[in-house]
Amino acid sequence: DAEQKACPPGKEPYKVDEDLIFYQNWELEACVDGTMLARQMDLVNEIPFTYEQLSIFKHKLDKTYPQGYPESLIQQLGHFFRYVSPEDIHQWNVTSPDTVKTLLKVSKGQKMNAQAIALVACYLRGGGQLDEDMVKALGDIPLSYLCDFSPQDLHSVPSSVMWLVGPQDLDKCSQRHLGLLYQKACSAFQNVSGLEYFEKIKTFLGGASVKDLRALSQHNVSMDIATFKRLQVDSLVGLSVAEVQKLLGPNIVDLKTEEDKSPVRDWLFRQHQKDLDRLGLGLQGGIPNGYLVLDFNVREAFS
């Protein structure tokens, strides 16, 4: 900045207008004032400035608002939102759902998933509610963004949103996220019965506890192996052979193809081989007959 040239005489603009189109980049840098841009954001958007010119304007705004843009400016950003990075957005404080919806509309179809997600996370952080309208405004963005929210932000997500989540959406979720989402899904689908309930809840079963899985095994759900593989290891290893047999039903045969992969392998290690043999699938890796299993977690508690 020490090298920055001075604004040539008569070039200081008093308003945002089309004449700025003719300015050299260094003239924009030298002459344009960030507060003026913020006041006339509508014109910044309307006048066909080039991307290069807009990036200079952004630099000006960033210098004017080093702590992040005020909400009054964020509300007016319009198309300019496209030039803002997720890192910028994390500095913001957004409380108005209308601001979020307006900006999500701008970002639609613009390869701006990261910005859209950052914006919603920022809104949730400020105590906002992610409603179905907002999820719809997020449009085609896979709901995997739920896994990007902090656990605190997730608390603000209404249970009704769980109806929109698909199986691939939770692939990258942490165990903590899955647990929270599972709880929300349980309350979202509480009035759904039978097989339809299982169809809906199975996306979230990665967050289910051993107790939940035991309860589920009583309902002849015939869980497919893909869903079984998504269960968390800690919950799975607590299930007996009989419980897994009930849980998988006719799909129990698919365990054989997965016996050397986690989490099936982890579960096999915790079962007695004689119980596995009763399945007649040739599953290996169980505890040999006559061996005693010591639970070191329990022993540590007494030492």
């Epitope: 089309e18 003719f22 066909p48 991307y51 807009l54």
Partner: antibody, heavy 119, light 111 residues
Amino acid sequence: QVQLVQSGAEVKKPGASVKVSCKASGYTFTGNYINWVRQAPGQGLEWMGIINPHGGDTKYAQKFQGRVTMTRDTSISTAYMELSSLRSEDTAVYYCARWHHGTWIFDYWGQGTLVTVSS
Amino acid sequence: DIVLTQPPSVSGAPGQRVTISCSGSSSNIGSNYVSWYQQLPGTAPKLLIYNDNQRPSGVPDRFSGSKSGTSASLAITGLQSEDEADYYCSSWDRADGSYVFGGGTKLTVLG
């Protein structure tokens, strides 16, 4: 009423230059930018650049950068477009067009000037 | 150097409705207004639609413009023989600060 009247047809040799004029009337000349657009025979429209008559600032399409010069004479409300190093592909009708503030469109056009480049 | 894509020609019988499409990108149509120009044979272009869907005074309401994302279209209803002309879509391009045109569409009114 607003009018843009252009100079007459020109025939030029390859390598030469041509200067087309566009005289504005019916409005404040310095209050609206002037654009230049050309159209080769049987082809589409092609934007060449824009001049702000108030200060004389210009902005040219990359394709014409270095070969085109746009100027104006405010005393006679006239804009000029000079194209140098002419080649046969520059044979076209050259139009001046007024840019309408706030809508960024060309609301009035000159009648066109045919420039033929031929050896 | 054509940045906006239009069909080379369309045709329709008198009284019919035709549409002309114009496809661009996020740097032009996606972030700026679209205008349409009509060029009758042997004359200078004339503004037909501006700001995506606005008609200048004097342009019949048979002409209408619309835009969605990075595409725009011009619709002409109740076709008349005097509509036979070339139609150009255009927009500013934010990538290099130039004004871009479509390649033009020749409208033929049949019969």
